[in-house]
């Protein structure tokens, strides 16, 4: 039976009814409810919230709502033995200690169980030594230090500013450079916007504010002790020495008041250029060690955190599809927070809650979606995307056969300037068409579409007149669905106008000051941006679950494949002599991309013209669309990253948050001029080109006529 037969109202009316039911006032109320106490993963408070959400989703009308639990490795500070950093004099006396906690915001002084700032999964240790300032601790920062400035970080404690890249990459880079410890701090240059006051008077980071966060390098593994398999009752667990992605050196985060005290004494080399200088009143000398009078003083870290296997809980709600119940569209976002989670994650969880309520209202009126919609409240995202990954590992066989799409729903806002979307190219047309139908919430765009304000404020860098849609990277719960399983995925949120700080978050990210009041007073008093995000996320889910033909356009993959092939070829052509010497050719890849383009166009023609009343044909065409993303998965995974299996996209090896195209080829080419064995290095480039070529060609074949 067709989609419209599955309901008592026409499909167009369904979508309007669904969107009209979404209310800003409800999102506001839900956000307030979710942010009154901390909901740290593995705690009783977060278990209670899981049960509350389960109960409310049932009330809203979902067919079933279950809790699924896993026992995963988490990390906590030692309550009786706090973490801190000191400056010690030649006698070993502590002459300065960093603060043990963030001053709580007004009204929250008596809240218990606020976890002090820490770097989750840091090993214990008390290293002491000279300090080296390493800027953002990016790959290029260490290249600058080691290759240009000839500064050796071996045996040193490094201090790095947060921002630009995922903190786990910073720690990995420091480890590889031989550091014995890492201090992470928030520089005002990255976390204090000019002309804005500190919290509670504005949305800027106060000097005592600190960003928490995990420092793992999991590369998609999930629970460090059970990579590839769910962390259930009968799971085999690795020993800690074999655990995936754990850092080997102590790490600790601090605020800029404390950072000032460490950085102001720095001596040694001057910073190489202005890009290494933040906005503290310090010289930003690189070191190693302190200057002149202070040269005998050292820095000492005191880290006593423990890692322990702890139970976590996901909430999984189901709204059964009327026509294709075995096809799943998933809307998921996490529930666990570092402290109150005013933005991350509860601004997203509140939107999911309202989307569930609206779908529930339609169901109570007799409507059902064509396909099954699964709603998820993930646990332990902050500890390495653990809840979503374990659930996907447990259900991988079902997901790879039945998963149509995954829409992520973490923080709804990271600013209030314009829309930000990252998604598979299959969803480009869906996103563009949907945003053309939605009203912009932006001032100065009254009566205009969201598409219009988005295009104006965030234009595509290569396609003028269109808005920017970015590649999916990682650092959020879509990772396992997209990068490991090859399920078409997307995410949307409202963002800031801060192009220069592309991967530096909003100032109060992961601090105690991320409260309900932060959102209600400074970011979205009318909750109109939250409502818009609910409409985008909900609208995408609605279309994906209810349209007769899946709203995927394979021609858009052809466009980006050409662009990515051009890009990687241009990178390779920086080495024309070696390309000649080692007979490196991209001809096969360009040929495969051309074949994909041709077959995708032919498929689109058939899609337009086939008999949509024939259920077998319809299912066949939809399956070709659903399985296209899956066709880009290499079962062997990327080199040394077996859980990143998508050949077209992977998280950057240098920044987990960013997406890289043709990552296998990109990584093989990266810094190739420094490789010891150029013949082997260029051989790997050729191998990666052949894998990419095969994958693109194989994906194209899945779109060919089946017989």
């Amino acid at each position: 039976k067709s989609s419209s037969e599955a309901t008592n109202i026409t499909p167009k009316h369904n979508m309007k009814a669904f969107l009209d039911e979404l209310k800003a006032e409800n999102i506001k109320k839900f956000l307030h409810n979710f942010t009154q106490i901390p909901h740290l993963a593995g705690t009783e408070q977060n278990f209670q919230l899981a049960k509350q959400i389960q109960s409310q989703w049932k009330e809203f009308g979902l067919d079933s709502v279950e809790l699924t639990h896993y026992d995963v490795l988490l990390s906590y500070p030692n309550k009786t033995h706090p973490n801190y950093i000191s400056i010690i004099n030649e006698d070993g006396n502590e002459i300065f200690n960093t603060s043990l906690f963030e001053p709580p915001p007004a009204g929250y002084e008596n809240v218990s169980d606020i976890v002090p700032p820490f770097s989750a999964f840091s090993p214990q240790g008390m290293p002491e030594g000279d300090l080296v300032y390493v800027n953002y601790a990016r790959t290029e920062d260490f290249f600058k230090l080691e290759r240009d400035m000839k500064i050796n970080c071996s045996g040193k404690i490094v201090i790095a500013r947060y921002g630009k890249v995922f903190r786990g990459n910073k720690v990995k880079n420091a480890q590889l450079a031989g550091a014995t410890g890492v201090i992470l701090y928030s520089d005002p240059d990255d976390y204090f916007a000019p002309g804005v006051k500190s919290y509670p008077d504005g949305w800027n980071l106060p000097g005592g504010g600190v960003q928490r966060g995990n420092i793992l390098n999991l590369n998609g593994a999930g629970d460090p002790l059970t990579p590839g398999y769910p962390a259930n009752e009968y799971a085999y667990r690795r020993g800690m020495a074999e655990a995936v992605g754990l850092p080997s050196i102590p790490v600790h985060p601090i605020g800029y008041y404390d950072a000032q005290k460490l950085l102001e004494k720095m001596g040694g080399s001057a910073s190489p250029d202005s890009s290494w200088r933040g906005s503290l009143k310090v010289p930003y000398n690189v070191g190693p060690g302190f200057t002149g009078n202070f040269s005998t003083q050292k820095v000492k870290m005191h880290i006593h955190s423990t890692s322990e296997v702890t139970r976590i809980y996901n909430v999984i709600g189901t709204l059964r599809g009327a026509v294709e119940p075995d096809r799943y569209v998933i809307l998921g976002g996490h529930r666990d927070s570092w402290v109150f989670g005013g933005i991350d994650p509860q601004s997203g969880a509140a939107v999911v809650h309202e989307i569930v309520r609206s779908f529930g209202m339609l169901k109570k009126e007799g409507w059902r979606p064509r396909r099954t919609i699964l709603f998820a409240s993930w646990d332990a995202e902050e500890f390495g995307l653990l809840g979503s990954t374990e659930w996907a590992e447990e259900n991988s066989r079902l997901l790879q056969e039945r998963g149509v799409a995954y829409i992520n729903a973490d923080s709804s806002i990271e600013g209030n300037y314009t829309l930000r979307v990252d998604c598979t190219p299959l969803m480009y047309s869906l996103v563009y068409n949907l945003t053309k139908e939605l009203e912009s919430p932006d001032e100065g765009f009254e009566g205009k579409s969201l598409y219009e304000s988005w295009t104006k404020k965030s234009p595509s860098p290569e396609f003028s007149g269109m808005p920017r849609i970015s590649k999916l990277g990682s650092g959020n719960d879509f990772e396992v669905f997209f990068q490991r399983l090859g399920i078409a995925s997307g995410r949307a949120r409202y963002t800031k106008n801060w192009e220069t700080n592309k991967f530096s978050s909003y100032p109060l990210y992961h601090s105690v000051y991320e409260t309900y009041e932060l959102v209600e007073k400074f970011y979205d008093p009318m909750f109109k941006y939250h409502l818009t995000v609910a409409q985008v996320r909900g609208g995408m889910v609605f279309e994906l679950a209810n349209s007769v033909v899946l709203p995927f356009d394979c021609r858009d993959y052809a466009v980006v494949l050409r662009k990515y092939a051009d890009k990687i070829y241009n990178i390779s052509m920086k080495h024309p002599q070696e390309m000649k010497t080692y007979s490196v050719s991209f001809d096969s890849l360009f040929s495969a991309v051309k074949n994909f383009t041709e077959i995708a166009s032919k498929f689109s023609e058939r899609l337009r013209d086939f008999d949509k009343s024939n259920p077998i044909l319809l299912r066949m065409m939809n399956d070709q669309l659903m399985f296209l993303e899956r066709a880009f998965i290499d079962p062997l995974g990327l080199p040394d990253r077996p859980f990143y299996r998508h050949v077209i996209y992977a998280p950057s090896s240098h920044n987990k948050y960013a997406g890289e195209s043709f990552p296998g080829i990109y990584d093989a080419l990266f810094d190739i001029e420094s490789k010891v064995d150029p013949s082997q290095a260029w051989g790997e480039v050729k191998r990666q080109i052949s894998i990419a070529t095969f994958t693109v060609q194989a994906a194209a074949e899945t779109l060919s006529e089946v017989a």
């Epitope: 003028s464 269109m466 021609r555 466009v559 051009d566 241009n570 166009s601 032919k602 689109s604 337009r608």
Partner: antibody
Framework: EVQLVESGGGLVQPGGSLRLSCTAS????????MSWVRQAPGKGLEWVSA????????YYADTVKGRFTISRDNSKNTLYLQMNSLRAEDTAVYYC??????????????WGQGILVTVSS | QSVLTQPPSVSAAPGQKVTISCSGS????????VSWYQQLPGTAPKLLIF???KRPSGIPDRFSGSKSGTSATLGITGLQTGDEADYYC???????????FGTGTKVTVLG
């Protein structure tokens, strides 16, 4: 049989605007990249702009970037070229061309008859 | 200023063979497919060769294409008076993200 018919050309003053249209028939318009190619009097062919199949990603030659806008209406099987801030050197016969492969430009297997645009005061 | 270079003109007697070269770089001809177009006087261009060496239906096998490295060649054998026209090579340029045409070559049939 594929047919491409351009319209909207004519005489315009420097700094003025013009909108060219190209109506297509005989193939599934939405699946193919479409291009505009121009030829100044007595000169060679110059590719101006293309738009992909699918959602319609635009591409432009550096000479027209920021002044010309390509668009398509798949429901009307029509390709457009909005030309603003026209200059004397934009004077040419403008051809509409269909790609022979699919969603991005590879080669042009069908061409319109061309339309003359004259920019002069 | 075209990034693909062709000779301005070539000529030969009827029945003879002519070749037209098209020289580019690694970012265009080097890694992309070359096509050739014929433009008879006063008419729109017509596709002659695509994918370096393939002929659309209706194009006689007197016309052939080849590509080597960063250059492409169009060959016309058994030259006829009806072959008098301008010929253009064209390809995608991966660095410019743009389509590029050659400077064009005028073929004259002598006598």
């Amino acid at each position: 049989e594929v047919q491409l018919v351009e319209s909207g050309g004519g005489l315009v003053q420097p700094g003025g605007s013009l909108r060219l249209s190209c109506t297509a028939s005989g193939f599934i318009f939405s699946s193919y990249a479409m291009s505009w190619v121009r030829q100044a009097p007595g000169k060679g062919l110059e590719w101006v702009s293309a738009i992909s199949g699918g959602y319609g990603a635009p591409y432009y030659a550096d000479t027209v970037k920021g002044r010309f806008t390509i668009s398509r209406d798949n429901s009307k099987n029509t390709l457009y070229l909005q030309m603003n801030s026209l200059r004397a050197e934009d004077t040419a016969v403008y051809y509409c061309a269909k790609d022979g492969v699919g969603a991005t430009p590879y080669y042009f297997d069908d061409w319109g008859q061309g339309i003359l645009v004259t920019v002069s005061s | 200023q075209s990034v693909l270079t062709q000779p301005p003109s070539v000529s030969a007697a009827p029945g003879q063979k002519v070749t037209i070269s098209c020289s580019g770089s690694s970012s265009n001809i080097g890694n992309n497919y070359v096509s050739w177009y014929q433009q008879l006087p006063g008419t729109a261009p017509k596709l002659l060769i695509f994918d370096n060496n393939k002929r659309p239906s209706g194009i006689p096998d007197r016309f052939s294409g080849s590509k080597s490295g960063t250059s492409a060649t169009l060959g016309i054998t058994g030259l006829q008076t009806g072959d008098e026209a301008d010929y253009y090579c064209g390809t995608w340029d991966s660095s410019l993200s743009a389509y590029v045409f050659g400077t064009g070559t005028k073929v004259t049939v002598l006598g």
